[in-house]
């Protein structure tokens, strides 16, 4: 039902859901401080450009008591909960920061009004794509789903000069909640994915995915997981693996790869990682310096959301338009904000875009490298290493299926 | 607060080379690329390259390429732009500008500082 | 590469009139549009980034609308330091390329 807003008169709230069940096991303290943080940066930059506002959070927490089990499960009704709350105390603000899990974004979209705007750290989902009044900060599994696309259809690259049109997903059920997503939509048989590959499999158990890695009669050789080194190494151990077995890491948000003294275990070595580009680096933010490398992001996320809400706030005061109409909850799309790491973009359905990097090992100096980029705003792939030194025969990617000629 | 400051005027004659140099002061200067502009008397600007930390490689306008080098060097937080076979009409004013670009992409968001320029005139 | 036109390419205004140019990309460059001022004898500066974003420490009587192939630049209320030339650039894809400028004179 509609909630009236406390949102004019100089006085614009932030309400934030502090939910039990959250996309990443982040301490609600941090993403407290992230909050803080952001609000303190967009009083200033409103009072630099003359608007005499006042802009404040409210942090709304659930029970704990029947939603705990802290990770995505049971966020669906917590979210509802959460809304009902603030419906009895009439406690809604201009924007509603959070929730991060898919099935709590999905279900609050559905069942409510949303004349307000709503911005999440993570609702990765494809059945949170499109949504008119939502705003994703992290990258979504439409974004991955491109790329991966893109990839396998790259055939004029010097190290890639095969089109692929296979792949093996592995997925068993384990995943942290941005990998569930990430490979659900790879899964989804409706999906761009799927539709645009000739043969995709799921493989769910531990056997499965062993089994493959010398099986001559596997029908690609071409495996996408998703998680961290140390999630690959627990599967696969030190088992041989065919020599054009080509596995493809998804693991966006962790930039361990990218520091100085980080060497790639044996293991990763017929392992090309899928991450996000580090951007100008946050280490030694004042913000981030407790925070793991991905809960750098999450918390980054709910920073960048406080950010852009100042910036989108100073817009519409600016141009002396009202901050409680359909018109403010459907402007959180196609716009670039400066973000706490320098400008951000969101493209036309409100979803954060950013640069995938792909890496290889380097044989030579067992150091991580990047292979290419790839640009989420404009679809796009840039080569950077011409001549890596790859495990692979003559330093180039394999052909999908073994024994096939070139495509 | 960053500044770009770079070499002095250069007078030259047709058929040599000028290497100009920026060198960064106040901030990370492999965090962002470095472009090179000039502006003839009287005329526009005019983008000669760039290069972006993530490639390595610098990138050209095509009317330049082949005559221009762009390069970098880290620890002295300085970029250098060569322009060889100087003729009469690359008599102009040389800027270097840090550029925002996007990490691992050629999309940028504008040359947000910009160093003082240097005069290059080529004349026999 | 992708051509931009400015117009006009000069034109006379006094100080409190709001003065717009416009800029026309060659094809659709989303919002990567920028616009620069350049005082004579100095370097451009950044006024504009990404189509309609104020550069910090910018005057808010700029600003920048438009995405695709078409953008404007808006002065609200000129002011006597606002007497320049002024340039439109994409960043998109590379070569970055400019407009020819228009200078704003004294009326």
């Known amino acids: 039902s509609q909630v009236s807003q406390n949102c004019h008169n100089g006085s614009y709230e932030i309400s934030v859901l502090m939910m039990g069940n959250s996309a990443f096991a982040e301490p609600l303290k941090n993403l407290e401080d992230a909050v803080n943080e952001g609000l303190e940066i967009v009083r200033g930059r409103l009072q630099n450009a003359g608007l005499n506002v006042t802009v404040n959070a409210t942090f709304m927490y659930s029970d704990g008591l029947i939603h705990n089990s802290g990770d995505c499960r049971s966020s669906t009704c917590e979210g509802l909960d959460l809304l009902r709350k603030i419906s009895n105390a009439q406690r809604m603000g201009c924007v509603l920061i959070g929730p991060s899990c898919t099935y709590s974004t999905f279900q609050m979209y559905l069942d409510t009004e949303l004349s307000y705007p709503m911005i999440s750290a993570g609702s990765f989902g494809l059945s949170c794509d499109y949504k008119e009044t939502l705003t994703r900060l992290m990258s979504p599994a439409r974004k991955l789903m491109y790329f991966l696309v893109n990839f396998w259809k790259t055939n004029d690259l010097p190290f890639k000069t095969y089109s692929w049109s296979t792949s093996y997903v592995y997925k068993n059920g384990t995943e942290t909640e941005d990998c569930f997503w990430y490979l659900n939509a790879l899964e989804a048989s409706v999906s761009y994915f799927s539709h645009e590959l000739g043969f995709k499999v799921v493989l769910r158990q531990d056997k499965e995915f062993q089994d493959i890695l010398m099986d001559h009669n596997r029908k690609s050789n071409v495996i996408i997981m998703c998680g961290g080194p140390e999630f690959l190494y627990k599967l696969k151990g030190d088992r041989a693996v065919a020599e054009d077995i080509v596995i493809i890491l998804v693991d966006l948000f962790n930039d361990q790869y990218f520091e100085d003294n980080v060497t790639a275990p044996d293991y990763m070595k017929n392992v090309l990682v899928l991450t996000l580009s580090p951007g100008n680096s946050l280490l030694n933010s004042s913000f981030s310096r407790n925070l793991s490398p991905t809960k750098r992001d999450f918390a980054l996320a709910y920073l960048n959301g406080i950010l852009l809400f100042g910036h989108m706030l100073k817009i519409f005061l600016e141009n002396g338009e009202n901050i409680t109409t359909p018109k403010f909850a459907h402007a959180f799309r196609n716009l670039t904000f400066e973000g706490y790491d320098g400008p951000v973009t969101l493209d036309d359905w409100g979803d954060v875009d950013s640069t995938m990097v792909l890496l290889y090992t380097s044989v030579d100096t067992k150091k991580y490298k990047v292979l290419l980029t790839y640009d989420t705003h404009v679809n796009k792939t840039y080569p950077v290493d011409m001549s890596p030194t790859f495990t692979w025969k003559n330093s180039k990617l394999p052909n999908d299926i073994t024994g096939r000629g070139p495509q | 607060e960053v500044q770009l400051v770079q070499s002095g005027a250069e007078v030259k004659k047709p058929g040599s080379s000028v290497k100009v140099s920026c060198k960064a002061s106040?901030?990370?200067?492999?965090?962002?690329?470095i472009s090179w502009v000039r502006q003839a008397p009287g005329q526009g600007l005019e983008w000669m390259g760039g290069?972006?930390?993530?490639?390595?490689?610098?990138n050209y306008a095509q009317k330049f390429q082949g005559r221009v080098t762009i390069t970098a060097d880290e620890s002295t937080s300085t970029a250098y732009m060569e322009l060889s076979s100087l003729r009469s009409e690359d008599t102009a004013v040389y800027y270097c500008?840090?550029?925002?670009?996007?990490?691992?992409?050629?999309?940028?968001?504008?040359?947000?500082?910009w160093g003082q320029g240097t005069m290059v005139t080529v004349s026999s | 590469d992708i051509q931009m036109t400015q117009s006009p390419s000069s034109m006379s205004a006094s100080v409190g009139d709001r003065v717009t140019i416009t800029c026309r990309a060659s094809q659709s460059i989303s919002s990567h549009l920028n616009w620069y001022q350049q005082l004579p004898g100095n370097a451009p500066t950044l006024l504009i980034y990404y189509a309609s974003n104020l550069q910090s420490g910018v005057p808010s009587r700029f600003s920048g609308s438009g995405s695709g192939t078409d953008f404007t630049l808006t002065i609200s209320s000129l002011q006597p330091d606002d007497f320049a030339t002024y340039y439109c650039?994409?960043?998109?894809?590379?070569?970055?390329?400019f407009g020819q400028g228009t200078k704003v004179e004294i009326k």
């Open positions: 500008a840090r550029t925002r670009y996007i990490w691992g992409s050629y999309r940028a968001y504008g040359m947000d500082v």
């Open positions: 290069i972006i930390p993530i490639f390595g490689t610098a």
């Open positions: 106040g901030g990370t200067f492999s965090s962002y690329a």
């Open positions: 650039q994409q960043s998109i894809s590379l070569p970055y390329t």
